[in-house]
């Protein structure tokens, strides 16, 4: 479902030609400098060109726009607003373009924008209104269906004095504009936690990717409203155990498939319920691959092969018996 290029021929625009006519109003379907265009495929590619801003003279026919591998730095309000508007633009890929700031209303006036990829940009400043476009408590619905935000965490020294998770979630929830979102990818963002209200306000999600983060627990996260959720990727996190409430919620979702590989499962007495559930459920994909990381004596044991006798907790000694 990602934008793909067609075999149709692409026309390139030489930079000297563009500068020669820059004083003239742009032709409606010319190809911007440093870009390749295929009207037949309705695709414009401005890839690895070190562009510092979005071309102003994008052809009106564009449906798939690749602006990857550039140096855009900032995406201002109305970055894609044109007269006439880019009414057909459905898929926009801005990955790896060194964006560190996306301002409020950056994607306004794109009525058909279904798929947006901002991955691999160090987003130190993502406006809460980047996707909703306004600070109203309830905004006009965004047309976005797929939002790809993998590896958008900036280096630690470039982060603002606020929670990165909170910044991203604020942008996802603002104005309830993203209620139609069906795919959300948030992989590789060093998330330590998932704010409890985020999923409740994204009821149309079919696919959620939270892999390769640092999630330790899902205790306060509710999946109950995600009736349509089909895939939940939690591989490569820091999960130690899933508790009863989470297990019951996941089991209650009719279409869900959960991916839990490569988490440091702690196989002590708190794991008993999860092991029992794993043995019965069809929810978890590749459940036979899940192994214990702790305690040391249990390392590499397969969760499905454990029984209650294996899952013990060291007794907590009263203070008088504890040794230093």
């Amino acid at each position: 479902s990602s934008p793909t290029s067609s075999a149709s021929s692409f026309s390139s625009s030489a930079p000297f030609l563009a500068s020669a006519v820059s004083a003239q109003p742009p032709l409606p379907d010319q190809c911007p400098a440093l870009c390749e265009c295929s009207e037949a495929a309705r695709t414009v590619k401005c890839v690895n060109r070190n562009l510092t801003e979005v071309p102003t003279d994008l052809p009106a026919y564009v449906r798939n726009l690749f602006l990857t591998g550039n140096q855009l730095a900032v995406l201002p309000a109305g970055a894609f607003a044109r007269r006439p508007p880019l009414a057909e633009l459905a898929a926009l890929n801005l990955s790896g373009s060194r964006l560190d700031e996306v301002r409020a209303g950056a994607f306004e006036h794109l009525p058909s924008l279904r798929q947006l990829d901002l991955s691999h940009n160090p987003l130190a400043d993502l406006s809460p209104f980047a996707f909703s476009g306004s600070n109203a408590s309830v905004s006009a619905p965004s047309p976005l269906v797929e939002l790809i935000l993998n590896h958008i965490v900036p280096p630690e020294d470039e982060r603002q004095n606020r929670s990165f998770e909170g910044m991203v979630v604020a942008a996802l929830l603002a104005g309830r504009a993203l209620q139609g979102l069906r795919r959300l990818e948030l992989a590789s963002n060093h998330f330590l936690y998932l704010p409890r209200d985020v999923l409740a306000q994204l009821p149309s999600l079919r696919h959620l990717d939270l892999s390769n983060n640092s999630l330790v627990s899902l205790t306060y996260v509710s999946f109950r409203n995600l009736t349509h959720l089909e895939s939940l990727h939690l591989e490569d996190n820091a999960l130690k155990v899933l508790h009863n409430g989470t297990l019951a919620e996941l089991q209650g979702l009719p279409h869900i498939r959960v991916f839990l590989d490569n988490n440091p499962w702690v196989c002590d007495c708190h794991m008993a319920d999860m092991v029992t559930w794993l043995k019965e459920t069809e929810v978890v994909q590749g459940k036979d691959r899940l192994t214990c990381a702790y305690p040391e004596k249990m390392r590499n044991r397969v969760l499905l092969e454990l029984n209650s006798a294996d899952l013990d907790c060291d007794p907590i000694l009263p203070p008088s018996l504890q040794t230093s």
């Epitope: 479902s1 058909s112 279904r114 269906v145 797929e146 139609g180 069906r182 795919r183 149309s204 079919r206 696919h207 349509h228 089909e230 895939s231 009719p254 279409h255 869900i256 498939r257 069809e282 929810v283």
Partner: antibody, heavy 117, light 113 residues
Framework: QSVEESGGGLVQPGGSLRLSCAAS????????MSWVRQACGKGLEWIGI???????YYASWAKGRFTISRDNSKNTLYLQMNSLRAEDTAVYYC????????????WGQGTLVTVSS | DIVMTQSPDSLAVSLGERATINCQSS????????LSWYQQKPGQPPKLLIY???TLASGVPDRFSGSGSGTDFTLTISSLQAEDVAVYYC?????????????FGGGTKLEIK
Amino acid sequence: QSVEESGGGLVQPGGSLRLSCAASGFSLSSYWMSWVRQACGKGLEWIGIIAGRGSTYYASWAKGRFTISRDNSKNTLYLQMNSLRAEDTAVYYCARVSSIYYTFNLWGQGTLVTVSS
Amino acid sequence: DIVMTQSPDSLAVSLGERATINCQSSQSVYSNNELSWYQQKPGQPPKLLIYYASTLASGVPDRFSGSGSGTDFTLTISSLQAEDVAVYYCQGSYYSGSGWYYAFGGGTKLEIK
């Protein structure tokens, strides 16, 4: 990527038939799959659908007589049809549902089922 | 049961002229825009033209467009070509607490005048 139906043929009223749909180039278990039928010179009629994890949903007229199942190891979808009637005579198509939108984005060529004595 | 009504049943349009087909659902489709249009030529399976009410499927010419929301939808062919002669079907997707339901319209046969 493609799907191919098989198993159609002539069956007597009251009889049973199992149609198969073999998927190539993609994993059947990763998609919702559906069966649709079309009587000669008539319109398309939705039969039912199987979700990725195996939940099934049917048109009201198909409940009880028609059963959709899947064998992931064989990458094959099935339609079990029981108590067949003359009005079940049709071309039966299997179709894949998009992973994001609830639309049929890949169709087989169909297999003809004729119910007649 | 959900009923999808297509109109007209058949349509004859001159080459180069606009063709318009309507589809009305007895209930709102899921998320108000889960409506697809298919083209079927004799002896062939249906081919997806438009999904999500207005999104053109890959490889479909620009002369096809879709519009509408909720219960009322339209397929438009801006300039009819000879290869557009076919039967066109709308299809809605529906969700309720009891699960999913799909329904097709009765079809519209498009011919050249």
